[in-house]
């Protein structure tokens, strides 16, 4: 069964700055990701990025840079300041869809006892979902 | 969690008409576009035709002139009007919700499908 990780990390240098780095274990294309805050994409949470293989990015603020890691996994740089900027036990959310196949979709935060700088390995957290 | 749900497909003859519905639940945010993408066995995965969020409807070249995409914002639904429908339009159809890169809308969620036959 696909899945999908959510690593969330606060930058040491800016500690209002996030980087989340998603990833999809499984087999098949994907058609899009799709990065989001406070819920999941489809359920009250608000999009940060979406990356499509071939036809490019698009970001909102406060993202800062969404980029390819892989072919199956992908980061984004968030800038904290002012009204918009995440906090500590922000979730964050990415969606992997393969159209028509179907999406898979998890989620996760800042783990509470982390340090700047250091992060926890990349596990599959178990919001999953496939349409 | 987004639910779209199409209905209106069958089989019809060559020339025919079908008019396919898509009633969504609710959007993503930001998403930008909805449309229509369709598939045959054995050909390549086809954007028919989506409305941007400025209302603009856009169609692949296949079926301008021939096929109208609508909206109606009140019940949150999609509509392809398919008129003097050939057998290569015989597909699944499947209606989209996504986000905008260019002229191409990239389905973000997506209906389970609906089978369109036109036989000659």
């Known amino acids: 069964t696909p899945e999908v990780w959510v690593q969330v990390r606060m930058e040491a240098t800016e500690l209002s700055s996030f980087t989340i780095r998603c990833g999809f274990l499984g087999s098949g294309s994907i058609s899009l990701v799709t990065v989001s805050w406070g819920g999941p994409n489809g359920a009250g949470g608000t999009t940060l990025a979406v990356l499509h293989p071939e036809r490019g990015i698009r970001q909102w603020a406060p993202a800062r840079q969404a980029r390819w890691e892989t072919q199956s996994s992908i980061s984004l740089i968030l800038e904290g300041s002012g009204a918009s900027s995440p906090c500590a036990n922000t979730t964050f959310c990415c969606k992997f869809a393969s159209f028509p196949e179907g999406s898979w979709e998890a989620c996760g935060s800042l783990p509470p006892s982390s340090d700047p700088g250091l992060s926890a390995p990349p596990t599959p957290a178990p919001i999953l979902r496939a349409d | 969690q987004v639910q779209l749900v199409e209905s209106g497909g069958g089989s019809v003859q060559a020339g025919g008409s079908l008019r396919l519905s898509c009633a969504a639940s609710r959007y993503t945010s930001r998403t930008d576009c909805m449309g229509w993408f369709r598939q045959a066995p054995g050909k390549e995965r086809e954007g028919v035709a989506h409305?941007?969020?400025?209302?603009?409807?856009r169609y692949v070249e296949s079926v301008k002139g021939r096929f109208t995409i609508s909206q109606d914002h009140a019940k949150n639904t999609l509509y392809l009007q398919m008129n003097s429908l050939k057998p290569e339009d015989s597909a699944t159809y499947y209606c989209?919700?996504?986000?905008?890169?260019?002229?191409?809308?990239?389905?973000?969620?997506w209906g389970q499908g609906t089978q369109v036959t036109v036989s000659s």
């Open positions: 409305i941007d969020s400025d209302g603009i409807p």
């Open positions: 989209v919700v996504g986000f905008k890169f260019g002229d191409y809308c990239a389905p973000n969620d």
